[in-house]
Structure formats: structure tokens, C-alpha cells
């Protein structure tokens, strides 16, 4: 099942500062940066048949909450 984007907020750490759209939370520096500065997957153009460039990640068929493709690229961190 496809899930909506989820944030990096969770029970195991304080919630990161919410990022504005087009920004992503970088765990290594622990603040928001332009998503373009991170290797965020780019969506395929409509009708594209090849895998999206810049990523070798894909979701498992039965992904648990917050683990799959829908988690990328986490802009906004609502």
C-alpha cells in the first residue's frame, strides 16, 4: 500500500526542526538543507520506463510504516 510522505520525527529522538518545502532534514548535520544538496531520488518523467536516476533504492512489496519509497525525499518534515 502506498503511504503519504512521512517525516524523520519519531519516538527515539527530538523532532527535527520542520523544513520548509524544497528543504530536507540532513541527519548528519541535524538541520534543514536544500534537497538538491542531498542525493534525493528524482521522480521519473511521465511515461519514463527506466528506473529513476540517482538512486538504487526501492521499497519492499509489503513495506512497514515509514520505510519505503514514500519516505523519500522527506521535504517539509511536517
Amino acid at each position: 500500500m502506498r503511504r503519504g510522505p512521512r517525516s524523520l520525527r519519531g519516538r527515539d529522538a527530538p523532532a527535527p526542526t520542520p523544513c520548509v518545502p524544497a528543504e530536507c532534514f540532513d541527519l548528519l548535520v541535524r538541520h534543514c538543507v536544500a534537497c538538491g544538496l542531498l542525493r534525493t531520488p528524482r521522480p521519473k518523467p511521465a511515461g519514463a520506463s527506466s528506473p529513476a536516476p540517482r538512486t538504487a533504492l526501492q521499497p519492499q512489496e509489503s513495506v512497514g510504516a515509514g520505510a519505503g519509497e514514500a519516505a523519500l525525499p522527506l521535504p517539509g518534515l511536517l
Epitope: R6, S7, L8, R9, G10, R11, D12, A13, A15, P16, C24, F25, D26, L27, L28, V29, V33, G36, L37, L38, R39, T40, P41, P53, R54, T55, A56, L57, Q60, V63, G64, A65, G66, A67, A71, L72, P73, L74
Partner: antibody, heavy 118, light 111 residues
């Protein structure tokens, strides 16, 4: 498709500085994190450090005093220097890059064996 | 540093059998609701290959017989039915915090 290729001398003398370069194609090193990892013969993997999109660096504390990672954005390359090497630094050296947001190293170079010997 | 301990060190199995590999972390690798645990396969003379990221997600091109599970400190990589090409060394790796660390590896060998 992102490709990484390590290059540099395969033989370094003790007490000298090991220098390796990773050439990246298919992506810009001004985005993401660019890492060095090594593997001693027949052993496990050891993380060395990274240089980031901004040029900031992180070095594993176990090697920090001897390591320098730098980059040349015009050539889309990043480099590793390890000083005062000994035989214990003989290893296969890999460059690798993780994706976001899971920081899983999905792209690797093929590795280059560096032997420290006189 | 987060220490990862893999068991067993060696697993001797036959093609078609199920392989269960374990990785235990010295502290939780969960953060922001994500388990930052990854699994790699390495064959002699080759670079490690990402199999599983974020504990349970297969990387591109990885067959469905590979699956990952776990959270917190205890993680498992399962190969449901071993193929001849699956005999290799498997490493877990945490990407919760630097220095990123690897387990010592589990060698899956032909019985």
C-alpha cells in the same frame, strides 16, 4: 547511473603518505556525501570518513590524526590521504556514496588494493 | 561507536535451504521512527553490494528471496531459499550515526 572509480599507487612505503582519488561520474560531488571505507585482507569493513556536499569532512576518530579527505569539484573527484602508513594500513580502499534519507551506501567503487611495504 | 555483532560467523547450508543471519547493535539504531540498519553482500574480489536498507527494504535489483527485519538493536537478514550465487559474506551496517560501523560479517558457505 552513478559510477565511482578509485585510482592511485598500489604500493606505498612505510612512513609515507597513501594518496587515492575517487572519480565520480553520473552525479556531482557537490550533492551528497562521499566516503572512504577500507578492508584489510580477509577482514571486515572499516569506515574512514566522508566529505560532504559543502566540503565539510568527518574522520573516524580511530584514524583522525592521519587522515585528510579533500575534493576537486572541477574534476568531480575526491581524495584520501593517509599519512605515516604502516603495514597495518595494507587494505583494499573503497569509495562509496549513500543515498538520502537512509544513508545506505548504494554506490561503490570497485576498490583498489594498497600494499604498504618497503 | 555503535558496535555491531553478527552471528553466526559461518553458516554452512545447501542450495534451497533457508538462511537466517543475525546482527545485534550495542545500542538502538532507530531514530525518527526509522531503523538505520543496512545489509550488504560481498563476494571475493568484489565491492560490497547493498541488499537491504532501513532494516527491511530491498535495493534495486535484489531478488525477493532476500528480506530484512528487526528494529532497535536486533536485526535479521533472511534468504528464503539459497541460490548458488548467494554463497558469500554478508555484513550489517548502521547508518544512524558516524562513525558508520559494520558487523564482522557472516560467511554463508556451501555445506
Amino acid at each position: 547511473q552513478v559510477q565511482l572509480q578509485e585510482s592511485g599507487p598500489g604500493l606505498v612505503k612505510p612512513s609515507q603518505t597513501l594518496s587515492l582519488t575517487c572519480t565520480v561520474s553520473g552525479d556531482s560531488i557537490t550533492s551528497g556525501y562521499w566516503n572512504w571505507i577500507r578492508q584489510h585482507p580477509g577482514k571486515g569493513l572499516e569506515y574512514i570518513g566522508y566529505i560532504s556536499y559543502s566540503g565539510s569532512t568527518y574522520y573516524n576518530p580511530s584514524l583522525k590524526s592521519r587522515v585528510t579527505i579533500s575534493r576537486d569539484t572541477s574534476k568531480n573527484q575526491f581524495s584520501l590521504k593517509l599519512s605515516s602508513v604502516t603495514a597495518a594500513d595494507t587494505a583494499v580502499y573503497y569509495c562509496a556514496s549513500p543515498n538520502y534519507p537512509f544513508y545506505a551506501m548504494d554506490y561503490w567503487g570497485q576498490g583498489t588494493l594498497v600494499t604498504v611495504s618497503s | 561507536d555503535i558496535v555491531l555483532t553478527q552471528s553466526p560467523a559461518t553458516l554452512s547450508l545447501s542450495p534451497g535451504e533457508r538462511a537466517t543471519l543475525s546482527c545485534r547493535a550495542s545500542e538502538s539504531v532507530d531514530n525518527y521512527g526509522i531503523s538505520f540498519m543496512n545489509w550488504f553482500q560481498q563476494k571475493p574480489g568484489q565491492a560490497p553490494r547493498l541488499l537491504i536498507y532501513a532494516a527491511s527494504n530491498r535495493a534495486t535489483g535484489i531478488p525477493a528471496r532476500f528480506s530484512g527485519s528487526g528494529s532497535g538493536t536486533d536485526f535479521t537478514l533472511t534468504i528464503s531459499s539459497l541460490e548458488p550465487e548467494d554463497f558469500a559474506v554478508y555484513y550489517c551496517q548502521q547508518s544512524k550515526e558516524v562513525p558508520w560501523t559494520f558487523g564482522g560479517g557472516t560467511k554463508v558457505e556451501i555445506k
